[in-house]
Amino acid sequence: EVEKTACPSGKKAREIDESLIFYKKWELEACVDAALLATQMDRVNAIPFTYEQLDVLKHKLDELYPQGYPESVIQHLGYLFLKMSPEDIRKWNVTSLETLKALLEVNKGHEMSPQVATLIDRFVKGRGQLDKDTLDTLTAFYPGYLCSLSPEELSSVPPSSIWAVRPQDLDTCDPRQLDVLYPKARLAFQNMNGSEYFVKIQSFLGGAPTEDLKALSQQNVSMDLATFMKLRTDAVLPLTVAEVQKLLGPHVEGLKAEERHRPVRDWILRQRQDDLDTLGLGLQGGIPNGYLVLDLSMQEALS
């Protein structure tokens, strides 16, 4: 709490300007009127106040708006946003994308703080869904934003927003998240032709089921090994050697380097050695010739 002291003669702030830059903590408290500060918030950003000075200015706004700041003030918080707590932000009602952008700009180049996470959460909940413009904005500032959402939260992303997603935005997504995003991407890109479709859908394929991978194998897509290694193991296992060969095209040779890693390792174990030998890659570990393979899961389903 800043001690209440009278403002020294001649130091009363008539406007928020550079003359305040070196005011002491108590001088700012005594000489800056909260209502003046609120109406001239847009000027605070242009003055290189210290963190301690920003604390004093925040304290003034808190006294003026105990129930939470109006959006007209929030939009111009600038560096004062760095002093806000998640509890402060939960009192806000942020509806404008411009306000969101302005506050994210302040935090640019830094990791997502609890304050930013709370702000985004408030904004998205207020909108009801993660629309394309919001997603565009958020992934521009935080490429990993999409992968920070739970599968439940991702379910509110409309397919139209998927167009805003870049491959790097999905780098840290886990299979559960891709399971939700893949059907949306499939819907979003459904009217594209084969090669263009594959370029767009490639980043989402970690959520693709077996039947879609089989369909892709008929389209000469030449999937690279990095993408193949991110596919769901349960989706890869039912693929035949011929289907994997068609799916990977010239990249099939890369299987040898990955034969000890999932999903390649598990897929090899499910293939006949005879079939693997046709690839000429020296892949070992397939089902020996003459052995009969019983699919027990199918047996159980039938009974």
């Epitope: 305040l20 070196f22 002491k24 950003n45 242009a46 290189p48 210290t50 963190y51 600038g78």
Partner: antibody, heavy 122, light 106 residues
Framework: EVQLLESGGGLVQPGGSLRLSCAAS????????MSWVRQAPGKGLEWVSA????????YYADSVKGRFTISRDNSKNTLYLQMNSLRAEDTAVYYC???????????????WGRGTLVTVSS | IQLTQSPSSLSASVGDRVTITCRAS??????LAWYQQKPGKAPKLLIY???SLESGVPSRFSGSGSGTDFTLTISSLQPEDFATYYC?????????FGGGTKVEIK
Amino acid sequence: EVQLLESGGGLVQPGGSLRLSCAASGFTFSSYAMSWVRQAPGKGLEWVSAISGSGGSTYYADSVKGRFTISRDNSKNTLYLQMNSLRAEDTAVYYCAKRRDSYGPYWYFDLWGRGTLVTVSS
Amino acid sequence: IQLTQSPSSLSASVGDRVTITCRASQGISSALAWYQQKPGKAPKLLIYDASSLESGVPSRFSGSGSGTDFTLTISSLQPEDFATYYCQQFNNYPLTFGGGTKVEIK
């Protein structure tokens, strides 16, 4: 090229005066608050004074208050430090330094001059 | 605000992991910067906001901490890293520097 170049240092007797200059180039000088930082021989760094971008506001460390005056001429891209009533303990290398960002609470320095030595001795 | 650096000097070999600490007399959030200074040269900014690496600074340098206790770490000391390191707080005026830590060759 972005740089700062100090000049004006030298040997002066106790009680004497010196005026240091710092010529800036390669950035929009008037947009940045500027500082003087000094370093006594074999010692650490001490922030001496600062001035706002327009030159309208100034700050001084207690050790130099009332004796030193910081100023700037934005038309010449030059920062000054007028040092009066010099004492032996003012002997140091004086650096001018630029804040990394023109805005925000980021009072750290990404650009420093090479420094100019001020020696106060009889 | 007073900043106390420790140790004031240390001897290390190339390849060593080096840790320097800086303690503030009161909380300063993450308003701390680290500089490297070589003899006869001006200080060079390494780290700002306690943990953000300045552009062009090798990734072997890292910073951590918040509040009153901060650390500068050099993961694998290189010949060019032998120098004096200073912390600086920018939470409030007057801006203050730590006393410095001299890293010497063992």
